[in-house]
């Protein structure tokens, strides 16, 4: 049973325009176009959005008007396919326009580029930003939606509207301040960080839908919702999971208007049924739509019921275990996942799904034997190693993070992952290590019972991006092996990888380690990336270098940069000291 209205509408576009309102309608259409055609300029897309909106208004006025009965995919696809020079700019994506719906839309979806060759989204100076924001807030926000959506083609559209709203509020507040810069920078950095995490998390959900289908996603949703709403019964959790699956499936399928509409409907349902869901929803439910839906998506866990019986009662000790399993496998496994998850808000969803998988495999094996209870009687004890592995991972990595700080921790991960997959391009390794390294800042400062879910589920999302980038140009058998398995096994697979013994080390090229004075004026982040690029290249040259050797080289390198950047004649310092540094590096690693 789902909450969504199913009545047919004569005009789908009129129906969505009425439900969403003009502002959200236009924002979502802009996101959709920007995610499909990632190279087009804002002005090109804005023109199409205006045309679609004008058309929607004619359909609102008269649902029987010409073409108002067409599907949204047909209407949007026709707009996109009418863009001039489509083949010159997009190559084979233009072939999608030769197909009929619904193939055309799915063709567009398959051509979304997770790593488009677009320059990084640079934030203008505070004064310039405030000027253009004051001149035309709508255009300013349109640019924001366009720039984020084209770089993140699977960004969760209704959530992107929320971030745009946050952006708007920050600018409204800070542009009225005397010191705009110091007001804007930390606030916008916070929004950017949250949005980037939101992007990789949503991409993981779409990967799950694409590769494994809604069955896998629904299992994820049941576990996650059971942790958050431990007082809701199984029927309620199943209903919410079904609806959440539909919403995500729509967004991943490019049906952004339906997705946003259904998400609003789900938020409304949750707020109308707080009594059967959770005692923690009221604060969220008092907020306006975008904030409400966002708030509900990350609401704190409800207090666990005090009188929950031991999990063993129904799933190990009950004499009917095999009978119940055989009668309705999915429902029985679903109730196991629900019961286990609501008792363990301290576990990651990935871990809970691995435990459910282990339980299923045990029943498959044991229920075919002569004495099933004797066979599955120890199943809960067999969970122990599966639970210990991620717990140890969290402890080891958080200890390392506390010792080294974020930058040092990123470097440790970079060395580790370059050794695991040295064939992967250096930019990809650096990006992955920087993202994986942020897990420390994000999760290691949390209370003990929140660390594991934070660490493992975040790492899984980042590793999903590694897999997507590697899929484009597969170069490492190690990475292919870990990315080919199920989503929940990826993180343990990557963690278990060791030095790739098949790799032939890169020859030492002096130019890779030659630097110029322009590095001195780079922002701190860019400087770090340059140093991390050199570190990855060192490991590719000497995959078996010890941590001590690498530390010696990197300390020397940092000292060299510090000295030359402080020198009166920077260029001379770089050109004379640089070669000496290269020689010392070679010697240190010999």
């Amino acid at each position: 049973r789902g909450v969504f209205r199913r009545e047919a509408h004569k005009s789908e576009i009129a129906h969505r325009y009425n439900d969403l309102g003009e502002q959200h309608f236009k924002g979502l259409v802009l996101i959709a176009f920007s995610q499909y055609l990632q190279k087009c300029s804002y002005d090109e897309h804005a023109k199409l959005v205006q045309e679609v909106t004008d058309f929607a208004k004619t359909c609102v006025a008269d649902e029987s008007a010409a073409n108002c009965d067409k599907s949204l995919h047909t209407l949007f696809g026709d707009k996109l396919c009418a863009i001039p020079n489509l083949r010159e700019n997009y190559g084979e994506l233009a072939d999608c326009c030769t197909k009929q719906e619904p193939e055309r839309n799915e063709c567009f979806l398959q051509h979304k580029d997770d790593n488009p060759s677009l320059p990084p989204f640079e934030r203008p100076e505070a004064e310039a930003m405030c000027t253009s924001f004051k001149e035309n807030p709508t255009t300013f926000m349109g640019h924001y939606l366009h720039e984020v959506a084209r770089r993140h083609p699977y960004f969760y559209a209704p959530e992107l509207l929320y971030y745009a709203e946050q952006y708007n509020e920050i600018l409204t507040q800070c542009c009225a301040e005397a010191d705009k810069e110091s007001c804007l920078t930390p606030k916008l950095d916070g929004v950017k960080e949250k949005a980037l995490v939101s992007s990789v998390r949503q991409r993981m959900k779409c990967s799950s839908m694409q590769k494994f289908g809604e069955r896998a996603f629904k299992a994820w949703a049941v576990a996650r919702l059971s942790q958050t709403f431990p007082n809701a019964d199984f029927a309620e959790i199943t209903k919410l999971a079904t609806d959440l699956t539909k919403v995500n499936k729509e967004c991943c399928h490019g049906d952004l208007l339906e997705c946003a509409d259904d998400r609003a409907e789900l938020a409304k349902y949750m707020c109308e049924n707080q009594a059967t869901i959770s005692s923690k929803l009221q604060t969220c439910c008092d907020k306006p739509l975008l904030k409400k839906a966002h708030c509900l998506s990350e609401v704190e866990h409800d207090t666990m019921p005090a009188d929950l019986p031991a999990i063993a009662a129904d799933f190990v000790e009950d004499q009917e275990v095999c009978k119940n399993y055989a009668e309705a496998k999915d429902v029985f496994l679903g109730t196991f996942l629900y019961e286990y998850s609501r008792r363990h808000p301290d576990y990651s969803v990935s871990l809970l799904l691995r435990l459910a998988k282990k339980y299923e495999a045990t029943l498959e094996k044991c229920c075919a034997e002569a004495n099933p209870p004797a066979c599955y009687g120890t199943v809960l004890a067999e969970f122990q190693p599966l639970v210990e592995e991620p717990k140890n991972l969290v402890k080891t990595n958080c200890d390392l993070y506390e010792k080294l700080g974020e930058y040092g921790f990123q470097n440790a991960i970079l060395v580790r992952y370059t050794q695991k997959a040295p064939q992967v391009s250096t930019p990809t390794l650096v990006e992955a290590a920087r993202n994986l390294g942020r897990v420390g800042t994000k999760c290691c400062t949390l209370p003990e019972d929140q660390r594991l879910p934070c660490v493992e589920d975040y790492l899984s999302a980042i590793l999903n991006r590694v897999c997507l980038l590697h899929e484009k140009t597969p170069v490492s058998e190690h990475v292919t092996k870990c990315c080919s398995g199920s989503l929940v096994e990826r993180r343990p697979c990557f963690s278990a990888l060791t030095v790739d013994e098949t790799y032939v080390p890169k020859e030492f090229k002096a130019e890779t380690f030659t630097f110029h004075s322009d590095i001195c004026t780079l922002p701190e982040k860019e400087k770090q990336i340059k140093k991390q690029t050199a570190l990855a290249e060192l490991v590719k040259h000497k995959p078996k270098a010890t941590a001590e050797q690498l530390k010696t080289v990197m300390d020397d390198f940092a000292q060299f940069l510090d000295t030359c950047c402080k020198a009166a004649d920077k260029d001379t310092c770089f050109s004379t000291e640089g070669p000496n540094l290269v020689t010392r590096c070679k010697d240190a690693l010999a």
Epitope: E106, M209, R215, A216, C252
Partner: nanobody, 125 residues
């Protein structure tokens, strides 16, 4: 394993109607959607129509919209493709397919795990 059997194909005149049926049997596995594809010798298999098992949502390729209607009978694990106003272009082997995971795409053959043997539909002018 799931077994799929298609029947109802045959030779008809342009403008006539045919009703294809597909019966799914085998282990009790959730069916998320069932689809019909068609193939002409020397060409790729082409998506025709699909129906979701729970909501009954349907998708049709543009060229058959208004002429073909897809329906299902969940109790019998059957899906039917009613084909009206047939054209010579509709001549092909029609295959029934099942998606047991609920994958994202409707029109990709890789979204479907189980396939029938196919039934020939010939429309003469």
């Amino acid at each position: 394993q799931v077994q799929l059997v298609e029947f109802g194909g045959g030779l008809v005149q342009a403008g006539d109607s045919l009703r294809l049926s597909c019966a799914a049997s085998g282990r009790s596995l959730g069916i998320y959607k069932m689809a019909w594809f068609r193939q002409v010798p020397g060409k790729e298999r082409e998506f025709v129509a699909a129906i979701s098992w729970s909501g009954g949502t349907t998708r049709y390729i543009d060229s058959v919209k208004g002429r073909f209607t897809l329906s299902r009978d969940n109790t019998k694990n059957m899906v039917y493709l009613q084909m009206n106003s047939l054209k010579p272009d509709d001549t092909a082997v029609y295959y029934c397919a099942v998606d047991s995971s609920g994958r994202l795409y409707w029109t990709l053959s890789t979204s479907y795990d189980y396939w029938g043997q196919g039934t020939q539909v010939t429309v003469s002018s």
